[in-house]
Interface confidence: low
């Protein structure tokens, strides 16, 4: 049979993108649940995912409400059946997390290349301007909106019968780039800010090349 | 009682992703488990892919991690693995299973109580 | 990753006798996430004993598990005919979780 002994939680990890925001951590409970807490290096703890046999919570709710704020969580365990009972110290065992700053931190989710349009040697390429869920009266801000011009994306672009590869940049969701008439020409984006000293960059978009159905063409 | 039942196409060509779903009858998926896949190759022991739980939580086995994606869709009672770059190694049976914690004199337990039948997935060209 | 060593691989009795399989970890496991498993050919594991020792719903009491840290057994006493099959031990604490390589149990 069980034992009340409690372990506390370890490996607290945030995992964090477009401001999706959880905290992780081990081990899977055998003696115990857990409860987090929360908080802004200044506030009150505010308590979230009460008592559960999982091992991660959703903290989202909590960090959008102001994402350059530095959160600090920490996991509770409590001997399974018996919540009100506390350890030898009088409280029951918890781990920090490290801080967590989501504006410098989460990271850039893989960018969509939206659509793309040719008119004669130029090709306009729209990366989609992805819904965030930071809140601001009642409506979710698009990455854009919450980083504003620290986001740039990166084309990277190639003819499809070569591998040598350009790159253009913008401060906005749409690239302008030449390209050779009559020549299909394949590409891909990544999110990147600069400023940042980790986490820089998304993940790349998946690959779109000309002649497929998202492009237009116009002579 | 709570059944599992894996589906999924039999047949899938190298480089391609294997696409697997696992309805749950006779019980929630909400109701506190995890959901594991669980693979074995032909003539040989058996393989944890990964589990989740049905807030979305998800551990995998390292040696698959890169490869691997499961979700669960608490709507349709169904938890999915998506398996991406296949090659022939990827051939076996797949199986579905509840990863029950269960909570007895002050602890918790888990074991795999529910199994699906097992779907054969053969990757070739 | 904690590797589940099992042994025998095959093991050739009669019915009536008694079957002591073992399984072996690499590392210390908690009894909590230590189960046995029993795989007939065409058909999925069946749960037979979770907790090391605690017999799962619906399984006779010939069947009994034992062992705790790193050494566990499963036991079944007196061998029926439908008994004879693979059997898998399985840990669900540790990342990656594991099963042993399996012991065969086959009519002598």
């Known amino acids: 049979s069980g034992t009340t002994n409690t372990v506390a939680a370890y490996n607290l990890t945030w995992k964090s993108t477009n401001f999706k925001t959880i905290l992780e951590w081990e081990p899977k409970p055998v003696n115990q649940v857990y409860t987090v807490q929360i908080s802004t290096k200044s506030g009150d703890w505010k308590s979230k995912c009460f008592y559960t046999t999982d091992t991660e919570c959703d903290l989202t709710d909590e960090i959008v409400k102001d994402v350059k704020q530095t959160y600090l969580a920490r996991v509770f365990s409590y001997p399974a059946g018996n919540v009100e009972s506390t350890g030898s110290a009088g409280e029951p065992l918890y781990e920090n997390s490290p801080e967590f700053t989501p504006y410098l931190e989460t990271n850039l989710g893989q960018p969509t290349i939206q659509s793309f349009e040719q008119v004669g040697t130029k090709v306009n390429v729209t990366v989609e301007d992805e819904r965030t869920l930071v809140r601001r009266n009642n409506t979710f801000l698009s990455l854009r909106d919450v980083f504003g011009k620290d986001l740039i994306y990166t084309l990277y672009y190639w003819k499809s019968s070569s591998s040598g590869k350009k790159t253009a940049k913008t401060n906005t969701n749409e690239f302008l780039i030449d390209v050779e008439k009559g020549v299909s020409y394949c590409f891909f984006a990544q999110a990147v800010i600069p400023s940042r000293t980790v986490n820089r960059k998304s993940t790349d978009s998946p690959v779109e090349c000309m002649g497929q159905e998202k492009g237009e063409f116009r002579e | 009682q709570v059944q599992l039942q894996e589906s999924g196409p039999g047949l899938v060509k190298p480089s391609q992703t294997l696409s697997l779903t696992c309805t749950v009858s006779g019980g929630s998926i909400s109701s506190g488990q995890y959901w594991s896949w669980i693979r074995q190759h032909p003539g040989k022991g058996l393989e944890w892919i990964g589990e989740i739980y049905y807030s979305g939580s998800t551990r995998y086995n390292p040696s698959l991690k890169s490869r691997v994606t499961i979700s669960v869709d608490t709507s349709k009672n169904q938890f999915s693995l998506k398996l991406s770059s296949v090659t022939a190694a990827d051939t076996a049976v797949y199986y579905c299973?509840?990863?029950?914690?269960?909570?007895?004199?002050?602890?918790?337990?888990?074991?795999?109580?529910?199994w699906g039948k097992g779907t054969t997935v053969t990757v070739s060209s | 990753e904690i590797v589940l060593t099992q042994s025998p691989g095959t093991l050739s009795l009669s019915p009536g006798e008694r079957a002591t399989l073992s399984c072996r970890a690499s590392?210390?496991?908690?009894?909590?996430?230590l189960a046995w498993y029993q795989q007939k050919p065409g058909q999925a594991p069946r749960l037979l004993i979770y907790?090391?020792?605690s017999r799962a719903t619906g399984i006779p009491d010939r069947f009994s598990g034992s062992g705790s840290g790193t050494d566990f057994t499963l036991t079944i006493s007196r061998l029926e005919p439908e008994d004879f099959a693979v059997y898998y031990c399985?840990?669900?604490?540790?990342?990656?979780?594991?099963f042993g390589g399996g012991t065969k149990v086959e009519i002598k």
């Open positions: 399985q840990q669900v604490g540790v990342v990656p979780y594991t």
């Open positions: 907790g090391a020792s």
């Open positions: 590392q210390s496991v908690s009894s909590s996430y």
């Open positions: 299973a509840r990863d029950t914690p269960y909570y007895y004199d002050g602890g918790y337990y888990y074991y795999m109580d529910v």
